[in-house]
Interface confidence: low
Amino acid sequence: TLNSVLNSNAIKNLPPPLGGAAGHPGSAVSAAPGILYPGGNKYQTIDNYQPYPCAEDEECGTDEYCASPTRGGDAGVQICLACRKRRKRCMRHAMCCPGNYCKNGICVSSDQNHFRGEIEETITESFGNDHSTLDGYSRRTTLSSKMYHTKGQEGSVCLRSSDCASGLCCARHFWSKICKPVLKEGQVCTKHRRKGSHGLEIFQRCYCGEGLSCRIQKDHHQASNSSRLHTCQRH
């Protein structure tokens, strides 16, 4: 979290594998079309992906982060890099995809335990447990509170995706940001190609859900570049 406002989460340089030498990322991201990114134990290719140059995180999508793709992490050319999904290695909160955060070098769901130390959620319950345990994490319950804070529901104003409930991400809507549904298989997604295109996107879509990536729809391969339709597809 690492991390406060806006756009969220991605990988700057990959951490070394367990037991690996410090300072040497586990992999580098190719800047060529057909960009390789780590997805579990093997690399996966995103069809016809054009690296999107950026200077600020805000120029990248909600499932990306602006960073150098080089091993050394030199500033130089920066592009939008894919965030790390749940159970993948990380070094800081922003490397993890929206709805996750970095705990002990692994991206975990922010529904379980968010940010530094344990999350304390103030919630109202109708029964008398002062302390209940969920998923192995202590969750403090304040019965006397009239106000209670839950994760933002669809349409709620947010600043980043960890503020939204599971299955939602924080995305731009006009000049604000609200919780929107994470995209499902077959839904249209946005793959940015031109510098500046993010700035024009006042109705921002969420990223594709777990196990999905934003690719050109198969029957649109022959279409012109400008009209290619991207959808969330299984890896």
């Epitope: 690492l2 800081r92 600043l159």
Partner: antibody
Amino acid sequence: EVQLVQSGGGLVQPGGSLRLSCTASGFTFSNHWIHWVRQAPGKGLEWVSGINWNSGSRGYSDSVKGRFTISRDNAKNSLYLQMNSLRAEDTAVYYCARERPVATGAFDIWGQGTTVTVSS
Amino acid sequence: EIVLTQSPATLSLSPGERATLSCRASQWVSSYLAWYQQKPGQAPRLLIYDASNRATGIPARFSGSGSGTDFTLTISSLEPEDFAVYYCAWQEFFGQGTKLEIK
């Protein structure tokens, strides 16, 4: 002027309670994660607690977990730290600090600090 | 837990000299490192974030470099007001500080 102004420190006996306040001005308070960092006499900086913009997520260091409670009131541009069961080792200058908007864990605006002394 | 080790503990230099402060992380932290300056009786001030970016209002004589586990704060030509304690930090973890004193 962008600033954080603190109040609420003082002398308290071990086992006692104290509430620190931090009031923001010059920026949109509700856009930021805000933190408490402390510094014991002659020692270095120690992160204590942090809270997100809508109070939905709060973090605590192991040394204060279960004793301190962080909260905020965005309508009043205010941050609070309720400190209970205070110990001698909690004696320190306490700072509130704003995390940078696109957060990388860096605190760019700090309060002036308030001294908490726990002693019998 | 990340441990940040700063060296030297104390650095004695004269105005106009170049200061080089080191910070080593116990784990790989990419380039997400911050540097703070603190003078006696004052709150810390952010100098550098993301290892090499100067914070607003920080003079150009301050520069940061490094990534991975080894980081450096350089003050190209010391001014009298630069003598203070400097901390490196990654998220909530702070180094123990380097005291920069006038020789």
